[in-house]
Interface confidence: low
């Protein structure tokens, strides 16, 4: 028997520095977690103690904090090189700055293979990107070899900006021939490393013949055997065992997100490359694990540029940006309109001639808007200003919901109207009319939504049975502010870009902004 230790991360999302327990900015260092300096300590400790160790990342290192906004992926290459990662799979967010934003800072600088078997380049890009990422890589580990085959969510064109010269194929269809190729090369231990979410990870384990282990990402899935060490609730045991169609037991793992845990899986193979046993658990990277001093010093050096950036002007406003709770929790506010417009703009993806865009709607809880921005400071807007408006370090995500769920959400928005509660929704691509004289649960008298399958966008009545795409804060997707119906009834959920980054990019693009209150939210006569 031969034993392999797989260390794995996924969906780190730019958390290079340690964070608080909820993965937001670290406030009390004695209770902070994660970060690359702490990760390095644990990885080195395991490498010294065990003979056959692989350190793998399942994608979405990009996007999530000011680190990515400023360094645009150079920080990912630098610190992953420093930690000596063995391989990485491409995630959807690796394409957030386009293909160039992946090639230059990461693909050309990484000293480890970057993988995806189901992304095929065409046209002029094919020769430019050739060899910079691979479908698979055979890695020597001790006296043996291990094949790593990569995959990426085929939804990436809807979630990021890969351009028109990359084709995202069905994961299973694309993986099988690559695994078969590895088998012909006499590689009998194969890990599928990728970024398509836990459901697809399980399908890959079930369907792709020859895959021994699946290391996944994208769905931020937390698996754990025994009593979990922090706030995350396990979606299943670690590893999660799938019985493949040809009768093998295939371990599937994921390690939550944000670098809070280091996945730790021990696999025992027989001489024919069959998995005999698998066990392990994610390791919580809490303050009991010291930060490595050399990596920490490097982090501090890179940090200086971030502090300078946060006070630089991103753009100007020539109007007061009303983000006060007196406005945003009671009526349409122009800060809400600005944020929603930025959210839609960030999701412009022309992937189908029949649609002007794949999504037109935004909802945003008024309670998530924490500050106004005064235009009387020469109109200047900085990252620091936006951090006061959106201080929680959330993301703006893409969900699919039935019309009936949206109707419930808008009823919830005003079910206890007048108490300055955070659930009052700000909107984009939606016209809503409330009648507050009616009883709670029956106050939405008109709900029109902007069409997507149209060349000239116009507002049509919401259809209860139709499935709509909506951009909203991850807080709402997770049922926050009492929006349990969204969490319970959503049909799909893909995590998006950092909230501040979305708004700052939009302001930088527009240069001068002047959002108005324009009748997106109305109250019918006599009730308000």
């Amino acid at each position: 028997a031969w034993e392999l230790t797989i260390l794995h991360t996924n969906d780190v999302h730019s958390r290079l520095e340690q964070t608080s327990e909820d993965s937001s900015k670290c406030v009390n260092a004695s209770r902070c977690m994660g970060g690359v300096a702490r990760l390095f300590t644990k990885v080195q400790q395991i490498r010294r103690a065990e003979p056959n160790v692989l350190l793998l990342d399942a994608g979405d290192q990009y996007q999530g904090t000011i680190w990515f906004t400023v360094y645009k992926g150079a920080e990912v290459a630098h610190f992953m090189n420093a930690l000596r990662y063995d391989a990485m799979a491409l995630g959807n967010h690796e394409f957030d700055n386009g293909v160039e934003g992946l090639i230059e800072p990461l693909l050309k600088e990484a000293k480890f293979p970057i993988l995806s078997a189901n992304i095929k380049a065409k046209g002029p890009l094919a020769s430019q990107i050739s060899g910079l990422y691979l479908p698979y890589k055979v890695l020597p580990v001790g006296d043996e070899v291990v094949g790593i085959v990569g995959y990426t969510s085929k939804e990436t064109p809807f979630l990021s900006n890969p351009g028109t010269n990359l084709v995202f194929e069905d994961e299973i269809t694309a993986l099988q021939p690559e695994v078969d190729k590895l088998k012909t090369l006499n590689v009998n231990k194969i890990i599928a490393l990728g970024h398509s979410g836990f459901e697809m990870d399980k399908l890959i384990a079930q369907k792709v013949r020859g895959v021994d282990v699946v290391v996944g990402g994208h769905s931020n899935t937390f698996l754990y055997t025994g009593n979990p060490p922090s706030k995350e609730v396990p979606a299943g045991k670690y590893p999660f065992i799938v019985t493949s169609d040809d009768g093998r037991k295939v371990p599937v793992v994921q390690a939550y997100a944000f670098g809070k845990y280091l996945g730790y899986l021990k696999i025992e193979f027989d001489e024919r490359g069959n998995v005999i046993s698998s066990h392990g658990n994610p390791i919580l990277l809490n303050s009991s694990i010291p930060e490595d001093p050399s990596i920490k010093a490097d982090i501090n050096k890179w940090r200086i540029k971030l502090d300078n950036y946060s006070t630089q002007e991103l753009g100007k406003t020539i109007v007061y940006l009303d983000g006060s709770s007196q406005s945003c929790r009671f009526r349409e506010c122009n800060m809400g309109n600005l944020i929603c417009d930025a959210m839609i703009n960030n999701n412009l993806r022309h992937t189908d001639e029949m649609f002007w865009n794949h999504v037109s709607m935004c909802i945003l809880n008024g309670g998530g808007i924490r500050s106004p921005i005064d235009e009387r400071n020469n109109g200047t807007i900085t990252w620091e200003n936006l951090a006061a408006v959106l201080p929680f370090g959330g993301t703006f995500d893409l969900v699919q919901l039935k019309g009936s769920t949206l109707k419930k959400a808008f009823e919830h928005s005003v079910h206890r109207y007048g108490q300055s509660t955070g659930e009052f929704l700000q909107v984009g691509g939606i016209h809503v009319v409330y009648d507050l004289s009616r009883k709670p649960g029956d106050r939405v008298v008109k709900l029109d939504v902007l069409c997507t399958k149209c060349r000239v966008p116009s507002y049509d009545p919401l259809k209860m049975d139709e499935v709509y795409k909506v951009i909203l804060p991850n807080f709402l997707a997770n049922g926050g502010d009492g929006f349990q119906m969204i969490k319970d009834e959503l049909l799909r959920h893909d995590s998006g870009d950092q909230d501040i980054n979305v708004v700052s990019t939009y302001i930088s693009k527009m240069k001068v902004i002047y959002p108005a209150v324009e009748g997106r939210i109305k109250f019918s006569t006599g009730s308000h």
Epitope: K154, E155, D170, I172, T173, Q176, P177, K207, R209, D245, D246, G247, L491
Partner: antibody, heavy 117, light 107 residues
């Protein structure tokens, strides 16, 4: 119980397009599985035409790639077959079925199509 | 494409007899093989998946065997309801292909 039901025109003229609908009850086509079109020629030969996966990806038989399109309406839990430029060779019984990366465990009863002027 | 070759094309047998139908794949399909039974004017019905696992509700007189490229379907003690046409089909990759069928008739 899962049920599939095909519907379509029965007779189509050569060079025209064929459109068929498969209505699924008892299971959401967005939940899992692949949703297929299969046809059976008069001599009983079965041919897999293509599928649409639960999340909307298509895979077609290369012999039909330039003529076939499979789409869906998730709100009605239906998926559709469109076959362009039909000839007498497309005369067959058309079945919809659930499966693809699994065997076809549920089939519709089939709809007979004749291509004739 | 993977070709599926079924034999015999037709077979006559009596109630109570045992028959075997074979199917050969042009390439290794591991255990990704299904068997179907079809009656005149009806849709095919799944009998066996993964080469040897009986589908739900299929009587135990049916059994599948084989892996790689050679497969067989055996029916012990034929019953009147067993007459019809039998097809094998691989689902190793696309395009999915069927055998030409074996027509089992009452002698």
């Amino acid at each position: 119980d899962v049920q599939l039901q095909e519907s379509g025109p029965g007779l189509v003229k050569p060079s025209q397009s064929l459109s068929l609908t498969c209505s699924v009850t008892g299971y959401s086509i967005t939940s899992r599985y692949y949703w297929n079109w299969i046809r059976q020629f008069p001599g009983n030969k079965l041919e897999w035409m293509g599928y649409m996966t639960y999340d909307g990806t298509n895979n077609y038989n290369p012999s039909l790639t330039n003529r076939i399109s499979i789409t869906r309406d998730t709100s009605k839990n239906q998926f559709f077959l469109k076959l362009n430029s039909v000839t007498a060779e497309d005369t067959a019984t058309y079945f919809c079925a659930r499966g693809g990366w699994d065997p076809f465990d549920y089939w519709g009863q089939g709809t007979t199509l004749t291509v004739s002027s | 494409d993977i070709q599926m070759t079924q034999s015999p094309a037709a077979l006559s047998a009596s109630v109570g007899e045992t028959v075997t139908i074979t199917c050969r794949a042009s390439d290794n399909i591991y255990s990704y093989l299904a068997w179907y039974q079809q009656k005149q004017g009806k849709c095919p019905q799944l009998l066996v998946k993964n080469a040897k696992t009986l589908a739900e509700g299929v009587p135990s007189r049916f059994s599948g065997s084989g892996s790689g490229t050679q497969f067989s379907l055996r029916i012990n003690s034929l019953q009147p309801d067993d007459f019809g046409t039998y097809y094998c089909q691989h689902y190793y990759g696309t395009p999915l292909t069927f055998g030409a069928g074996t027509k089992l008739e009452l002698k």
